[in-house]
Every structure is written in structure tokens, then in C-alpha cells.
């Protein structure tokens, strides 16, 4: 399962697309900044095993995919870029799922992993709640776009786990 290279490449492509998706100047959205509390401390302080890294990354990408697959998201972004971005995420999910199948049989601690997955879900719940409170305004989406780009680049510890031989 040659995940590190393919994942890094797809991740980079997704980030480039996300960067291109902006429709309004972010300079007009400064007052809409919000603390989403990405669980970086939990991630940074943990040495992820390969299977753990795969399942947490899968959850992050799945939640991002869900967020950008809503009707509200379709109204906010340029359609062709949104489709390309969603396709890139979908391919990443497929890659991760294929790797999970290959990694079956490797021991992991499911409960500990569930904690990380729950932290990711709560993080995306906070993002969804923020968008709802802001009535899915263009600036709210800009703030969320910046936050997702940041969280993608924060998941470096998870990517280190992908390179680890269990």
C-alpha cells in the first residue's frame, strides 16, 4: 500500500483547488474569524500507528467531503472547482479504504482511536454550527475554507503514521 506518495499528491491537489475556490476577498471577512479548536494538541502529542492514522485521516476527509457536498456549499462555490475538489477527496477516501483492507490483521487499540475520531467529528460539528449561525454567508464560507486548509496541513503527524511500519 503505497499511501504516503499518493496521499501527499492528492492532498496537495486538493489544497490547490481549495485555494482557488475563493470567490470574495478574504480581507473583507476579518471580523468573521472564529475559533474552531482543531484538536491539534491531541494529534501532536500522539504517535499514530499506521491503521490509526488511516482511520483518523479517513474521518477528516469524509467530514470535509460531507461539508462541501451540501446544497449550501454548492451555492457558495464555483461549480467546476467544487466538483474537482470533491472528486479529489473521493479518490483520497478510496485510497485510504483500499489501504485499510491491506492493513487488516494489524493490531490496534480501537477505543483510543475512537477518541480521535470523536474529536474530529466534534470539530466538524463546530464548523457546521458556525456556518448555520452565520446563515452560510460568503464570509463564513471563506473562514471555513481557510480553516479546512489549515487543518489539512496540521495533519502532518497523521501522515508520519502512514510511513510507520507497524
Amino acid at each position: 500500500c503505497d499511501l504516503p506518495q499518493t496521499h501527499s499528491l492528492r492532498n496537495r491537489r486538493a489544497l490547490i483547488l481549495l485555494a482557488q475556490m475563493g470567490r470574495i476577498s478574504p480581507f473583507s471577512c476579518l471580523k468573521d474569524r472564529h475559533e474552531f479548536r482543531f484538536p491539534e494538541e491531541e494529534f501532536d502529542g500522539h504517535q499514530f500507528q499506521k491503521t490509526q492514522a488511516i482511520s483518523v485521516l479517513h474521518e477528516m476527509i469524509q467530514q470535509t467531503f460531507n461539508l462541501f457536498s451540501t446544497e449550501d456549499s454548492s451555492a457558495a462555490w464555483e461549480q467546476s472547482l467544487l466538483e474537482k475538489f470533491s472528486t479529489e477527496l473521493y479518490q483520497q477516501l478510496n485510497d485510504l479504504e483500499a489501504c485499510v483492507i491491506q492493513e487488516v490483521g494489524v493490531e490496534e487499540t480501537p477505543l483510543m482511536n475512537e477518541d480521535f475520531i470523536l474529536a474530529v467529528r466534534k470539530y466538524f460539528q463546530r464548523i457546521t454550527l458556525y456556518l448555520m449561525e452565520k446563515k452560510y454567508s460568503p464570509c463564513a464560507w471563506e473562514v471555513v475554507r481557510a480553516e479546512i486548509m489549515r487543518s489539512f496541513s496540521f495533519s502532518t503527524n497523521l501522515k508520519k503514521g502512514l510511513r510507520r511500519k507497524d
Partner: antibody, heavy 121, light 107 residues
Framework: EVQLVQSGAEVKKPGESLKISCKGS????????IGWVRQMPGKGLEWMGI????????AYSPSFQGQVTISADKSISTAYLQWSSLKASDTAMYYC??????????????WGQGTLVTVSS | DIQMTQSPSSLSASVGDRVTITCRAS??????LNWYQQKPGKAPKLLIY???SLQSGVPSRFSGSGSGTDFTLTISSLQPEDFATYYC?????????FGQGTKVEIK
């Protein structure tokens, strides 16, 4: 280690042009905006403007709009501040500083060492 | 533009004193306020961001509070290295604006 390194001090005559630089290292240059701040001798801090190096989008303070131009070259992780025609009143220390954009993170957490610009006939 | 007014413009204090600097915004800026310290010939240094968050590496004797239009920077026990000029800056909207500064001098 995050660093913003600015170009050296400049002595110019009124009417001359000038471009000073700010080179970022130790972080993803396109993930942060770069702001410019002026400090005239013995005075306080004045925000001049800001650039998003990822797409070179800029915003200026009304006081500096049309007086200076902010640009960036992301391929060499460098932001610039330029004047087409300097005035004696442009004599000041100029600082660059990084800004997290729309992210909830510390504003202007790293600063350049400053570039002293002296304009005198 | 949002105007930022600091008070006092200067103060004299002794080592060990508790020092309070206030900053008032001309309109509500929620908690979008930063505090910086500047020493002569040096670049400003971020102390507090978003009104009350202590920047990494800054001593815990520095604290910030406030929301809306009124904000405070407190140095609980002034140290020799704290004699400097302090600036507040609103981070709510462009154009970003700074207070005029408060110079903390040795009594």
C-alpha cells in the same frame, strides 16, 4: 525557525524610487499574509497594508493607498514595499510582519528586524 | 476607521509594581484586540492576542482582558525588562489600527 528578514537600510533623495523586501523562511509562506507597518522617528506604529502571497491580493490603509505598492513573489518567499517617488516625510522605520489570515491564530506573531529608510536632499 | 485610544500615554513605576494599561475602541471590536511590547531600536513583540490569549513564550505576569470597546493589559509584577512602550491594535477589521502607545518608565 520562523524568520522574516528585511533588506538593509536605504538613504535616498526626494523623487527617487525604492523597493524594500521581506523574506520569509521556516514556515509555509503562502499560508500567511504579510503586513507592513511604518514607524516614523519617535512616533507610534501605523499599519500600511497587507498582502496574501498565495494570490497577491492586497489591502491598504486609506492613508497609504496610492502612496506605496505592496507585492510578493511566492517563488522566493519574499514580499515587497515600494515607492515610485519618495518624499522627505517617508523617512521612517518599516517593518513587515506575518498575519494568519482568516485563521484563529496570533496576529503579527513574527516581525522583520525593520528597514530604515532615510529620504533627504 | 476604528480609532484606538490608549491611556495613560506614559507612566512611571517601580520594579514589583502592578501596572495596568487601558485601550478603548471607537466601536465594538468583540475580542479582536492584540497587545505588543516595543523596546527602543527593536521590532514590536506580540504579547497578547484576541484580548486575553497569552502568546507562546511570553511570561505569565502579562495578562489581557476586556471585550467590546474596553480592554486592559496588566503586568502583575513589573520586572526590569518590562520597561518599554506598549501598543494595542484592533484586529477586527481593515484598516488595522494601533493605539498611540503607552511608555512605561522607571520611577
Amino acid at each position: 525557525e520562523v524568520q522574516l528578514v528585511q533588506s538593509g537600510a536605504e538613504v535616498k533623495k526626494p523623487g527617487e524610487s525604492l523597493k524594500i523586501s521581506c523574506k520569509g523562511s521556516g514556515y509555509s509562506f503562502t499560508s500567511y499574509w504579510i503586513g507592513w507597518v511604518r514607524q516614523m522617528p519617535g512616533k507610534g506604529l501605523e499599519w500600511m497594508g497587507i498582502i496574501d502571497p498565495s494570490d497577491s491580493d492586497t489591502a491598504y490603509s486609506p492613508s497609504f493607498q496610492g502612496q506605496v505598492t505592496i507585492s510578493a513573489d511566492k517563488s522566493i518567499s519574499t514580499a515587497y514595499l515600494q515607492w515610485s517617488s519618495l518624499k522627505a516625510s517617508d523617512t521612517a522605520m518599516y517593518y513587515c510582519a506575518r498575519h494568519p489570515g482568516l485563521n484563529w491564530a496570533p496576529d503579527f506573531d513574527y516581525w522583520g528586524q525593520g528597514t530604515l529608510v532615510t529620504v533627504s536632499s | 476607521d476604528i480609532q484606538m485610544t490608549q491611556s495613560p500615554s506614559s507612566l512611571s513605576a517601580s520594579v514589583g509594581d502592578r501596572v495596568t494599561i487601558t485601550c478603548r475602541a471607537s466601536q465594538s471590536i468583540d475580542g479582536a484586540l492584540n497587545w505588543y511590547q516595543q523596546k527602543p531600536g527593536k521590532a514590536p513583540k506580540l504579547l497578547i492576542y484576541f484580548a486575553s490569549s497569552l502568546q507562546s513564550g511570553v511570561p505569565s505576569r502579562f495578562s489581557g482582558s476586556g471585550s467590546g470597546t474596553d480592554f486592559t493589559l496588566t503586568i502583575s509584577s513589573l520586572q526590569p525588562e518590562d520597561f518599554a512602550t506598549y501598543y494595542c491594535q484592533q484586529a477586527y477589521d481593515f484598516p488595522l489600527t494601533f493605539g498611540q502607545g503607552t511608555k512605561v518608565e522607571i520611577k
